[in-house]
Amino acid sequence: TQHGIRLPLRSGLGGAPLGLRLPRETDEEPEEPGRRGSFVEMVDNLRGKSGQGYYVEMTVGSPPQTLNILVDTGSSNFAVGAAPHPFLHRYYQRQLSSTYRDLRKGVYVPYTQGKWEGELGTDLVSIPHGPNVTVRANIAAITESDKFFINGSNWEGILGLAYAEIARPDDSLEPFFDSLVKQTHVPNLFSLQLCGAGFPLNQSEVLASVGGSMIIGGIDHSLYTGSLWYTPIRREWYYEVIIVRVEINGQDLKMDCKEYNYDKSIVDSGTTNLRLPKKVFEAAVKSIKAASSTEKFPDGFWLGEQLVCWQAGTTPWNIFPVISLYLMGEVTNQSFRITILPQQYLRPVEDVATSQDDCYKFAISQSSTGTVMGAVIMEGFYVVFDRARKRIGFAVSACHVHDEFRTAAVEGPFVTLDMEDCGYNIPQTDESTLMT
């Protein structure tokens, strides 16, 4: 799994846009089975916040044991706390489930910082505010962990929604979503609307607040505005995509587009930040610093270590630039762009000092494992993980935080040549390349 404020462990060659309009596929295409526009029972089924992750309620076992489970598109294991831990209010008790089956196999998942390990089994799983189905799924019962569970996060497990290729211990362990699609009539697609609050939430506020929606098996048209634009899933392991151009306030970073995807670019709801490869991060920060130079910030702010606080109500959003990522489109030589605001990449944090300050951390950070479009990106958009058609859709989220002057955007089409050259081909060595 990716790392660096990676939850749960964790806190180009593109040409300039041209006037030429290319045909595009949006939701004008025929509706497919299961893609009806309203999924009332699933709307608002997520809670949480970007810094600690978004979670959905799930039940495991017979009789059902209710747990809150982190929604993570950057991993592929369904793993739940199965032993007492100081940060867990509750945990999966296998001995109380009549439907639990032991697979007599262990699993060990190390991260750059921390790890979890456990025992593999299967049990009956359902999602109360999801499709009305029960599936037998693989479950890693976490018996030991280090720096995995987050104090006060209110989740007790993780739902890895990516593909089998990155499942642990190996790709033979079927991920939950594969099991769901195989055993039911749920279409092979899910969509996420993560709603950042725009201000820090204390524990009781998180419990009371809506964090967003995970629509399993379809698209809910009430959760977005405008059109959905799709980018191909380059390879089915992580949700890998290709970025072809990056702009800060409309100014092209002018880097070889391979740099943007070195060594990959993924969409990951389990990572807090927008994480960028070192060279790209440095160029982006230089550009953001220049745009916001009317204010002086400590170096630690740009490293994500230090918060800055404005008098409550006076955050100068206007001095910070918008950031646009151009993604490969579905049509040859066509791209589209997603644009986020500082309201997404400045993450509100509780200041211990005073409630009369609005404090933020810079939520763009450096990565050694490629670009990670984490919660700060996803909070601007409704994101459709269309596994059936091997593509990811983006539309402006109906719940994104903005001001009266600017809004997040999804726009296209733009003519961009040689986009295939933007992808980086990771040298194939052994399986240890997945160890991060």
């Epitope: 630690g300 230090q306 404005w310 008098q311 009369q356």
Partner: antibody
Framework: EIQLQQSGPELKKPGETVKISCKTS????????MTWVKQAPGKGLKWMGW????????IYADDFKGRSAFSLETSASTAYLQINNLENEDTATYFC????????????WGQGTTVTVSS | DIVLTQSHKFMSTSVGDRVSITCKAS??????VAWYQQKPGQSPKLLIY???TRHTGVPDRFTGSGSGTDYTLTISSVQAEDLALYYC?????????FGGGTKLELK
């Protein structure tokens, strides 16, 4: 030019009330918080608290809760410090200071108002 | 409360000298430190904030440095007008506290 102009010196008796004004100019008053700092004769600087000039909400340091009150007259770009039930220990120079933009450093200061409490 | 200790109450110097005034915090204040200069009968003037950022109009002979708990204000070449009282202040958490001050005087 940014300026913070404080009211003149005050001579008060114990038990009385004093109200000091701090009139600002040269910037948007409601964008920057206003801090109050006490300096007793021959002593160092002590942070009394601050007031959010956008919301009007005051924050007091523990040692100054109870008898001190910060207020605003936004239309006049003026902040006020009132100290009730004065004691001899309140004899000091009081400074208003504009809080910095991104943190609580104090970038511009008034000239200070000396308050003497004596029976 | 975070305590700031300026170990030298007085420092003697000569015009043209390089002088360093130190400030130690009782806990890590993550470079949230400011420095002020105060002359007799005047209000303090901000010199440095965020440990090393020079305030508008402050001569470049004044530099701030440090991290964690240890911070320094350096005057590269002392001028006669620099003889004054210098205070450090932490803007990390409430209550925002000041050091006891260091008086820079002529030898």
């Amino acid at each position: 030019e940014i300026q913070l102009q404080q009211s003149g010196p005050e001579l008060k008796k114990p038990g009385e009330t004093v109200k000091i004004s701090c009139k600002t100019s040269g910037y948007t008053f409601t964008t920057y918080g206003m801090t109050w700092v006490k300096q007793a004769p021959g002593k160092g600087l002590k942070w009394m608290g601050w007031i959010n000039t956008y919301s009007g909400v005051p924050i007091y340091a523990d040692d100054f809760k109870g008898r001190s009150a910060f207020s605003l007259e936004t239309s006049a770009s003026t902040a006020y410090l009132q100290i009730n039930n004065l004691e001899n220990e309140d004899t000091a120079t009081y400074f208003c200071a504009r809080r910095g933009s991104t943190a609580h450093y104090f970038d511009y200061w008034g000239q200070g108002t000396t308050v003497t409490v004596s029976s | 409360d975070i305590v700031l200790t300026q170990s030298h109450k007085f420092m003697s110097t000569s015009v043209g000298d390089r002088v360093s005034i130190t400030c130690k915090a009782s806990q890590d204040v993550s470079t949230a430190v400011a420095w002020y200069q105060q002359k007799p009968g005047q209000s303090p003037k901000l010199l440095i904030y965020w440990a090393s950022t020079r305030h508008t109009g402050v001569p470049d002979r004044f530099t701030g440095s440090g991290s964690g708990t240890d911070y320094t204000l350096t005057i590269s070449s002392v001028q006669a007008e620099d003889l004054a009282l210098y205070y450090c202040q932490q803007h990390y958490s409430t209550p925002y506290t000041f050091g006891g001050g260091t008086k820079l005087e002529l030898k």
